[in-house]
């Protein structure tokens, strides 16, 4: 067991020319944090995959307000050292991601906002108990430097932070078979401890906690011998004697995932499946706790009140991910109401209404017709986030204020004069059409295309259209 | 934990005033909008007013429009309600609720306990 | 305004019973549409946003279903602790508004 250590020394443009902008300005003031994501080996693994070793958020720096015309400098960095334990041994080898996050502490609609600013990635060898390594890394026009280490924790000594000491228990010398623990010469290497139960006889370890069976022997503990009755379970190498297959030990038996992590077999050995919240080989390893807000925009930490303990985040609406790290596309959840646009600045959300609606998303209808009088005994009609009024006869306009010109539509056909009544129009219809519109021929032999016309009324003469 | 207590309410006579107070914690009260919802004895819920984490956006029901104001002190973590000309059917269990994350959806996802206003002669 | 209408008014149903509840919009809310639990004396819970989304720390026996102007609020197997009145609220325009209620009670 151990932790692996991370100083941030700086984080601010790199040389060259294209400097960045600052990220912080007077309208958004914002503040920086870190992540360091730990995996084993010299993995190319996506950033989005599990850290297997470990991850650790620090703390959020200093509020930081970009000078106007000043160049960005390198910028105020959280205090204190990033640690993440694991309780495995030291790989040697190991990929590690870094992210620089900014926190915009700006009053903007929907509050501060979380956006990352940089992430840089490598692969480095090192050994536990080693001095600081230093390293400079640039993510685009971005310049971090850091150092980092990895100690073990006692009584863990060694590269691998697997050798056990113990103090003496003489003064003069370690027991049959031990060597004295360098560089602590006052203590002796320790035997390894095997997991508790493990048969002395039939059982052994090369890491602290587990227990290997030696062969004829399984269990979690070894103390079972293998069946030859039985050939149900085709795994082990032949049996001369039976003549079929005896099963040796499985690598998930007794499952070695902790902390409820599933196992599933490999063709070289096992592959723990992890609950949210462990790492490690074994699940072993919880490096992150509520204590280190590993909830990212505004989502809420519950349990995981020690590193033993699994953390869970409640992510707000619009996030998603084990951490809230991931901004759902909102724009795919039409937050804007009543056909608006929607526009996804990062930053923030906003909408484009339609002609009609107002408010952050659309969400306020300004036509409709509350409160809203049609005059001259016109009605209101409402629908789709428009208001219209439907007039009586003689008014028009939106809000049937205007007198209507009823010949302005100019109804009369066939040259037939309009004139304005005070109920309507009048047709006055030129020689040989009749109709209160002017729309009937008249014929020559007197007859119309229609009965003839009311008594009293010749064709030609006008007529009221009501 | 997030918790909103409400404060102020009280017997007042038709036509006269009083102020509802809100108070937030466990959650940062400047990234999210506030509504007052209330209830009268017996009866479903109504909204009554809103406003968004800034301040800049408020709306209120018809039914309280140009007598309720609503406010906010982001620096005082306090939500308030100025309600005038206070009439018998304003008579009702006042809560305070707080508003989704950016207002996406509109939704009262934490609610106070209510303070009780009786408008009664 | 937008008029929600919630029915049944009231259900008697018995534990372990699956429970629908409906709630019908005047007009087309989307996706616009939360569920709320109250009980006496208390003070309203959100249950479900956006139609069908569980709200942190809301068991998974609460469902929710629909879009457009009809949606459901499903129980799969009712515990003594989900005898309450349920009211569904329209986030799509405002003013919001809200059902009239649904008060479930024990058989």
């Known amino acids: 067991a151990g932790v692996f250590e991370l100083q941030i020394h700086s984080f601010g443009p790199g040389p060259g020319p294209g400097a960045p902008r600052s990220p912080c300005s007077a309208r958004l003031p914002c503040r920086l944090f870190f992540r360091v994501c730990l995996k084993p080996g010299l993995s190319e693994e996506a950033a989005e995959s599990p850290c297997a070793l470990g991850a650790a958020l620090s703390a959020r720096g200093p509020v930081y307000t970009e000078q106007p015309g000043a160049p960005a400098p390198d910028l105020p960095l959280p205090d204190g050292l990033l640690q993440v334990p694991f309780r495995d041994a030291w790989p040697g080898t190991f990929s590690f991601i870094i992210e620089t996050w900014r926190e915009e502490l700006g009053d903007q609609i929907g509050g501060p906002a979380w956006s990352l600013l940089a992430r840089v990635a490598g692969r480095r060898r090192l050994a536990a108990g080693g001095p600081w390594a230093r390293d400079i890394q640039r993510a685009g026009a971005w310049e971090l430097r850091f150092s980092y280490r990895a100690r073990c924790e006692p009584p863990a000594v060694g590269t691998a932070c697997t050798r056990l000491c113990r103090p003496r228990s003489a003064p003069s010398r370690c027991g049959p078979g031990l060597r004295p623990c360098a560089p602590l010469e006052d203590e002796c290497e320790a035997p390894l401890v095997c997991r508790a139960g493990c048969s002395p006889e039939h059982g052994f370890c090369e890491q602290p906690g587990e227990c290997r069976c030696l062969e004829g022997w399984t269990g979690p503990l070894c103390t079972v011998p293998v069946s030859t009755s039985s050939c149900l379970s085709p795994r082990g190498p032949s049996s001369a004697t039976t003549g079929c297959l005896v099963p040796g030990p499985g690598p998930c038996d007794g499952n070695p995932c902790a902390n409820g992590g599933s196992c599933s077999e490999t063709p070289r050995s096992f592959e723990c499946t992890c609950p949210r919240g462990f790492y490690g080989l074994r699940c072993e390893v919880s490096g992150v706790t509520c204590a280190d807000g590993p909830c990212f925009n505004g989502g809420l930490c519950v349990g995981g009140a020690d590193p033993d303990s699994a953390y869970i985040c409640h992510c707000p609406p619009g996030f998603q991910g084990s951490n809230c790290e991931k901004r759902v596309d909102r724009c795919s959840l039409q937050p804007c109401r009543n056909g608006g646009l929607c526009l996804d600045l990062g930053h923030a959300l906003r909408c484009r209404c339609r002609a009609g609606f107002a408010g952050p998303r659309c969400e306020h209808d300004l036509d409709d017709c509350a409160g809203r009088a049609c005059a001259n005994g016109g009605t209101c009609v409402e629908g789709g986030g428009a208001h219209r009024c439907s007039c009586a006869l003689g008014f028009g306009g939106r809000d049937c204020r205007e007198r209507a010109d009823p010949c302005a539509a100019r109804p009369c056909a066939h040259g037939g004069r309009c004139y304005a009544h005070f109920s309507g129009l009048v047709c006055a219809c030129a020689p040989g059409y009749m109709g209160a519109r002017c729309e009937f021929p008249v014929h020559p032999d007197g007859a119309s295309a229609l009965p003839a016309a009311p008594p009293g009324l010749r064709p030609g003469d006008p007529q009221r259209y009501l | 934990e997030v918790q909103l207590v409400e404060s102020g309410g009280g017997l007042v006579q038709p036509g006269g005033s009083l102020r509802l107070s809100c108070a937030a914690s466990g959650f940062t009260f400047s990234d999210y909008g506030i509504h007052w919802v209330r209830q009268a004895p017996g009866k479903g819920l109504e909204w009554v007013a809103y406003?968004?984490?800034?301040?800049?956006?408020?709306y209120y029901a018809d039914t309280v429009k140009g007598r309720f104001t609503i406010s906010r002190d982001n620096a005082k973590n306090s939500l308030y309600l100025q309600m005038n000309s206070l009439r018998a059917e304003d008579t009702a269990v006042y809560y305070c609720?707080?508003?989704?994350?950016?207002?996406?959806?509109?939704?009262?996802?934490?609610w106070g306990q209510g303070t009780t206003v009786t408008v009664s002669s | 305004d937008i008029q929600m209408t919630q029915s049944p008014s009231s259900l008697s149903a018995s534990v372990g019973d699956r429970v629908t509840i409906t709630c019908r919009a005047s007009?087309?809310?989307?996706?616009?549409l939360n569920w709320y639990q109250q009980k006496p004396g208390k003070a309203p819970k959100l249950l479900i946003y956006y139609t069908s989304r569980l709200h942190s720390g809301v068991p998974s026996r609460f469902s929710g279903s629909g879009s457009g102007t009809d949606f459901t609020l499903t129980i799969s197997s009712l515990q003594p602790e989900d005898f309450a009145t349920y009211y569904c609220?329209?986030?799509?325009?405002?003013?919001?508004?809200f059902g009239g209620g649904t008060k479930v009670e024990i058989k």
């Open positions: 609720a707080r508003g989704d994350y950016e207002d996406i959806f509109y939704t009262m996802d934490y």
């Open positions: 406003i968004s984490s800034g301040g800049y956006t408020i």
């Open positions: 609220q329209q986030g799509n325009t405002l003013p919001w508004t």
């Open positions: 007009r087309d809310i989307t996706k616009f």
